[in-house]
């Protein structure tokens, strides 16, 4: 059987290294060797590249090496496949070296901001060593912020003047780290170089971008003053690297700017003690280059009625996120403030908050919250400068079995009855929503019985017990993940009813 006709011939000129052609089929059933016939010097010369020795047989690739690679030039290439049964020739293919030239990547040697020019990086690179001296090169510059996976690209061409080349990349974010990589190709070529080694540059710092401002209103003190915990952070969209030197706060009662008070702090939180009137609070951040735009907050008067518009709220878990959604009766409200913090018995150590716009849902990655911790989540509607009534819910990103079972005691022990009471498990040990309690009880050498009750029940009267019998009992608290037993207690039912004993006991 004759070999298959070589097809899909593809050639590439690796500048100053070799001219390589490949074709299909890559492998023949029987031993096949190939000849690649070339004409070059615009058809005046010809030669052959052969794969007829044992190491290169059955290999659908052949390379022509210097010094017979001339550039610029047009080549013709024809591949002959030969086996024991005969020869099969490919069609003749035509190749312009300028169109198939592949060169090395360039080397970025500098990525720097230019003093006084904002949001720009100047990229300087070295033209590849192995590239035609006089050729115009086309370039693709890829860049991304350091924490992003998504590359952006710009394309441009450069004449060869010197191998010190420059491109100014504009409209970047201030004070942000960028990763750069560059590739090039002769202007007429279809083949790009590989990408250069990635380099990192940082745009110039600017005055701070802005602040998000929020507050926690605490109950009024005995003297009538109201503690208000102010908190602020870099606005969403601010450069990752941005750092403020400090913050200026000023505040005054509505309609009375004469009573303005000012505070300077380097913290991102500050407690104010305000009167019962409406107050306005302003905060700016500053660095060595200037101040941010002003963040404004209205603190309502003590007796002000706040509007209510959130009708319902649901928290649900996806594979890696917690999603909170809410329904509102006020279509004009399109900004919301979400607060979340661990529901612990003591003062919460971490308190987080975030603004949501043009949406009625909020999402957080599960790994930003601690598993087995209950979180209080509150959503406040914000309409211009007014903050409405919050709607709150609780959520766990992952439930576990409680760390401890309920502490239980037996009260009012009777002849055939006993009242069991137990304490709620401390918040820190619940590890999930307690959905029910199960009482397990068993007479000495007898069968075990159980009774399950709702999580809001902390007392239960067991009946139909056997008189003068020792019982062991424990209460299990269960979450969605499973249950944990409390300590086992023992009691003995009475032989006869002791009313007088009970009277005495209550005195």
């Amino acid at each position: 059987v004759l070999p298959a006709k070589p097809e899909n011939i593809s050639c590439i000129f690796y500048y100053e290294e070799n001219f390589t052609c490949t074709w299909s089929p890559e492998k023949e059933a029987s031993y096949t060797w190939y000849k690649v016939k070339r004409t070059y010097s615009y058809g005046y010369k010809s030669d052959i590249c052969s794969t007829d020795n044992s190491t290169r047989g059955n290999h659908a690739s052949c390379s022509f090496l210097p010094p017979t690679i001339t550039n610029p030039d047009n080549y013709t290439i024809q591949v002959e496949a030969q086996n024991a049964d005969g020869i099969m020739k490919s069609d003749i293919t035509y190749w312009n070296l300028d169109a198939i030239m592949k060169i090395e990547p360039p080397e970025i040697f500098s990525v720097k901001s230019v003093l006084g020019i904002k949001r720009m990086l100047q990229i300087k690179w070295i033209r590849p060593v192995l590239a035609p001296h006089s050729s115009t090169l086309k370039y693709t510059l890829r860049f991304r912020t350091i924490n992003s996976a998504y590359w952006m690209e710009v394309n441009f061409t450069k004449e060869d003047i010197d191998r010190d080349e420059t491109y100014n990349l504009t409209e970047l974010q201030a004070f942000t780290e960028y990763v750069m990589t560059l590739r090039c190709a002769p202007a007429e070529s279809m083949f790009w170089s590989g990408w250069s080694q990635e380099k990192v540059g940082t745009t110039e710092e600017e005055a701070p971008y802005g602040l998000d401002l929020w507050r926690v209103l605490k109950p009024a003190m005995v003297d009538g003053r109201r503690p208000v915990q102010l908190m602020w952070k870099k606005a969403t969209g601010a450069p990752v690297l941005e750092k403020a030197l400090g913050y200026n706060i000023w505040y005054f009662p509505e309609n009375n700017t004469n009573l303005t008070e000012t505070v300077n702090t380097t913290n991102q939180t500050h407690e104010l003690y305000l009167g019962g009137k409406t107050y306005w609070v302003y905060v700016v951040s500053y660095n060595s280059l200037g101040e941010s735009p002003v963040a404004t907050l209205r603190i309502p008067a003590l007796n002000e009625k706040t509007f209510q518009c959130i009708e319902a709220m649901q928290a649900c878990l996806t594979q890696d996120q917690l999603v909170v959604e809410w329904q509102s009766s006020a279509p004009e409200v399109d900004t919301w403030m979400v607060e979340w913090f661990p529901d612990v018995d003591s003062e919460p150590s971490s308190f987080s908050w975030e603004s949501v716009s043009q949406a009625r849902n909020w999402t957080i990655q599960k790994d930003e919250l601690k598993p087995l911790w209950c979180y209080n989540i509150s959503v406040y509607p914000v309409l211009r400068d007014r903050v409405g009534q919050p709607y709150s819910t609780q959520a766990y990103v992952q439930e576990g079995i409680p760390s401890a079972g309920p502490v239980t005691q037996a009260d009012s022990i009777g002849v055939k009855t006993v009242t069991i009471t137990w304490k709620e498990i401390p918040k820190s040990k619940r590890n999930g929503f307690i959905k029910n309690y199960t009482i397990f009880y068993q007479a000495e050498d007898g069968k075990e019985f159980s009774k399950t009750v709702n999580s809001n029940i902390l007392q239960y009267r067991l009946e139909s017990l056997t008189r003068r019998t020792s019982y062991s009992l424990q209460v299990m608290a269960s979450t969605n993940a499973g249950g944990t037993n409390g300590t086992k207690i023992n009691f003995k039912t009475l032989s006869i009813s002791h009313h007088h004993h009970h009277h005495h006991h209550h005195h």
Partner: antibody, heavy 121, light 107 residues
């Protein structure tokens, strides 16, 4: 084999001048940027000057800017460093290096043996 | 300019030891750090480029790692011929800057 051979070092008084040379062989000289790096006795390495392959652009640190001039003669495959207004802190071994380069292997894969410049009265 | 802080400045070691030295850049330099070896009376020689690529002919007991601002150079099985001063250099952006060097001495 790539070879870089420096010459021209010696003892010179403060304020005087000296010119270093570096003859390159074993590669196409006019394809590559070249750089001078120095090392004060018992101290670390410090970049001194770089020049592009055509000689069209030069780079210097502030410590030598205006006093030192890097140049090249591609026909002779030779790199130069003209050092004027020399100071005692310029005392060092001066190395000629090829690069920074687009060729894999680090920016400065090839170094000469160095030439010692001593600035002292 | 980017400052490269190398530690420790010197180490007393024995043949066969595992030797680790560090280099910290004053800003993010990606993976653009080279490590050089300079033996007494000789010019520097590049061992590792681009943080972790070994130069041709360099024994595999020499390794480099790191990215961003923190880089490590390790000799897994110290040999007598490895006694030298080792320098890191950032090649992220001109000017190239070197660490102060780590000198290896025998105990």
């Amino acid at each position: 084999e790539v070879q870089l051979v420096e010459s021209g070092g010696g003892l010179v008084q403060p304020g005087r001048s000296l010119k270093l040379s570096c003859v390159a062989s074993g590669f196409t000289f006019n394809n590559y940027w070249m750089t001078w790096i120095r090392q004060a006795p018992g101290k670390g390495l410090e970049w001194v000057a770089s020049i592009t392959n055509t000689g069209g652009t030069t780079y210097y640190p502030d410590s030598v800017k205006g006093r030192f001039t890097i140049s090249r003669d591609n026909a002779k495959s030779t790199l130069y460093l003209q050092m004027n207004s020399l100071r005692s802190e310029d005392t060092a071994t001066y190395y000629c290096t090829r690069g920074p380069t687009t060729v894999v292997g680090g920016w400065f894969a090839y170094w000469g043996q160095g030439t010692l410049v001593t600035v002292s009265s | 300019d980017i400052v490269m802080t190398q530690s420790p400045t010197s180490m007393s070691i024995s043949v066969g030891d595992r030797v680790t030295m560090n280099c910290k850049a004053s800003q993010n330099v990606g993976s653009n750090v080279d490590w050089y070896q300079q033996k007494t009376g000789q010019s520097p020689k590049v061992l590792i480029y681009r943080a972790s690529s070994r130069s041709t002919g360099v024994p595999d007991r020499f390794t480099g790692s790191g990215s961003g601002t923190d880089f490590t150079f390790t000799i897994s099985n110290m040999q007598a011929e490895d006694l030298a001063v080792y320098y890191c250099m950032q090649s992220n952006s001109y000017p190239p800057t070197f660490g102060g060097g780590t000198k290896l001495e025998l105990k």
